[in-house]
């Protein structure tokens, strides 16, 4: 049975040239977690797998950094990347979870931080 | 427990346009992608693409594009996949699945749709 | 587009033996493979998703490997319902592309 909870940074936006990162946390399981995939909705960003280690997809390697931790950092950010960003745990024995961020790159200097949420 | 159930059988001239439904239900429609699959006659599966619903975003297989459009209603949670300028090779079961992004967990019974003179 | 390329088109084995279904795809796709079970006039059922990763409710004489380009679906020991055609899926990125299928037959 899965008991876990995904817990994201939600809703964030940030600044165009600038950069942010995509984070999440799974609690209230004792599964192990043996991949983390970060996608959009029609293409992989990365993966962190706990024997292969990061990959990180051609199309992003010039401005994407792995972590902090299982996180993701997205830099030199543009308007195109505002969109929906999905987290992937592979856990073992309970199975996946995801979580769903959705970042705004502005043009102007008031991105904030929207507020934490979880997706169960 | 998730279903995905399609519109039945149709026959097609060729010129036609096709409409098929999926009606959706065991989740929130707006939280997954609908994809559609063709599968011509003893053959193998050919994605044809998907409509994202909770931000309406669309994406199609080059091989499609312009003759194919996917949407769908909210208020029925019902998907559609629309093939236009059909020909002999539009033949073909037509699948709409969903599932983690781009891999399907769930299938409808899939479509016959039969072009024909 | 990514490309991928399964093996054997066809094969035969009898019950209880040991079956390996290879696909190979044109570039890296990391662990993004999935492993679908097709049967005459059914939809197709998902097997293994993310290379390694059985899909709930599948029998664990199931199994998948590999990453980067190289994939393998395992059937451990075949049992009569696994009978079918086998298909694999990148879903690294859009257009999403399956191998041309491997039918599995009664030898």
């Known amino acids: 049975m899965m008991t876990g909870t995904i817990e994201t940074t939600g809703n964030i936006s940030a600044e165009k040239g600038g950069s942010i990162i995509l984070q999440c946390h799974l609690s209230s399981t004792t599964a192990q977690v043996t991949q983390v995939n970060w996608e959009q909705q029609d293409q992989l960003l990365a993966i962190c797998n706990a024997d292969l280690g990061w990959h990180i997809s051609p199309s992003f390697k010039d401005r994407v950094a792995p972590g902090p931790g299982l996180g993701l950092t997205l830099q030199s950010l543009t308007v195109n990347d505002t969109g929906e960003y999905f987290c992937i745990y592979h856990t073992y024995p309970d199975g996946t979870y995801t979580g769903r961020i959705f970042l705004e790159v502005l043009e102007s200097s008031v991105a904030e931080h929207g507020a934490r949420f979880q997706i169960p | 427990e998730v279903q995905l159930v399609q519109s039945g059988a149709e026959v097609k001239k060729p010129g036609a346009t096709v409409k098929i439904s999926c009606k959706v239900s065991g989740y929130t429609f707006t939280d997954h992608t609908i994809h559609w699959v063709q599968q011509a006659p003893g053959k193998g599966l050919e994605w044809m693409g998907y409509?994202?619903?909770?931000?309406?975003?669309?994406k199609y297989n080059e091989k499609f594009k312009g003759r194919v459009t996917i949407t769908a209603d909210t208020s029925t949670d019902t998907a559609y996949m629309e093939l236009s300028s059909l020909r002999s090779e539009d033949t073909a079961v037509y699948y709409c699945a969903t599932g983690m992004l781009r891999w399907f967990a769930d299938w409808g019974q899939g479509t016959l749709i039969t072009v024909s003179v | 587009d990514i490309q991928m390329t399964q093996s054997p088109s066809s094969l035969s084995a009898s019950v209880g033996d040991r079956v390996t279904i290879t696909c190979k795809a044109s570039q890296d796709v990391s662990t993004t493979v999935a492993w679908y079970q097709q049967k005459p006039g059914k939809a197709p059922k998902l097997l293994i998703y993310?290379?390694?990763y059985r899909y709930t409710g599948v029998p664990s004489r199931f199994s998948g490997s590999g990453s980067g380009t190289d994939f393998t679906l395992t059937i451990s020991s075949l049992q009569p319902e696994d009978f079918a055609t086998y298909y694999c899926q990148q879903h690294y990125s859009t257009p999403l592309t399956f191998g041309a299928g491997t039918k599995l037959e009664l030898k």
């Open positions: 409509f994202y619903p909770r931000d309406g975003s669309t």
């Open positions: 993310s290379a390694s």
